[in-house]
Amino acid sequence: TEVKVTQPEKSVSVAAGDSTILNCTVTSLLPVGPIRWYRGVGQSRLLIYSFTGEHFPRIRNVSDTTKRNNMDFSIRISNVTPEDAGTYYCVKFQRGSSEPDTEIQSGGGTEVYVLAK
């Protein structure tokens, strides 16, 4: 059965300087491969967070993703700035063998509105 990626909120509003949570759950961890968050779409999309061990300033996972059955890949963005506004996508990849990982499913996106303090 196909993996489903769910982003329950179509949009969230957050005041500049505050934190916000972007929710994302998946229905399966198979096929194996990382889950990443992007802002925007297409060639110009920006990698925001990857659940592959690297450190990303201001962003952290919400749940304990070291649980082997974890299906919650929500993130918290701290100290939000106006530059953080945009649509965020939670994306499930299948690991590549000798080629790059392949995107297999994306959530519907969550638009982040940043309000003036």
């Epitope: 198979l30 194996v32 304990d64 070291t66």
Partner: antibody, heavy 118, light 109 residues
Amino acid sequence: EVQLVESGGGVVQPGGSLRLSCAASGFTFSSNAMSWVRQAPGKGLEWVAGISAGGSDTYYPASVKGRFTISRDNSKNTLYLQMNSLRAEDTAVYYCARETWNHLFDYWGQGTLVTVSS
Amino acid sequence: SYELTQPPSVSVSPGQTARITCSGGSYSSYYYAWYQQKPGQAPVTLIYSDDKRPSNIPERFSGSSSGTTVTLTISGVQAEDEADYYCGGYDQSSYTNPFGGGTKLTVLG
């Protein structure tokens, strides 16, 4: 520098118990899942237990399930393996290992020898 | 018995290329790693996530995968590479960490 130092090994009689410890330093222990891997004399590697970073979820192969218990104390940066109902076939060097994001192992301790013998 | 299969031994002359294979896991549910172990020492991680090499590991060690078989390649083998090499995996479908039985690499001469 990541360091993992095991202790608590020794000689124990069949049916006995032993608790191994692994002191971790050089990384944020509370952010990493951890595992125990053993190696019987002259044999290959065998994974025996894993635990999530927060300690709430544990994992075991059938060979030790119900006899071994993995736990951790993040305030002390220490990993534990409680071994009960020990058998001769549990004789091995026991290594603690840090897990990567996808549950492979990137750093290993030097190991501690457990001998189960009457 | 071991869930992953690798050859018991491989022999190679210094300067040549050694290849050690590992099979048995489902490609859709497994990640793979390679570990080196010298006599009396703890294992050392050479490759993780199929083909990622820790920063302290020489570039002559590389990992690759094709279908359900993964391969450790050691280019320009040196005498110090003589050791046991273990293929290890993480199986997402069972939450377990199987190993291969190990391959003894002998450097001839």
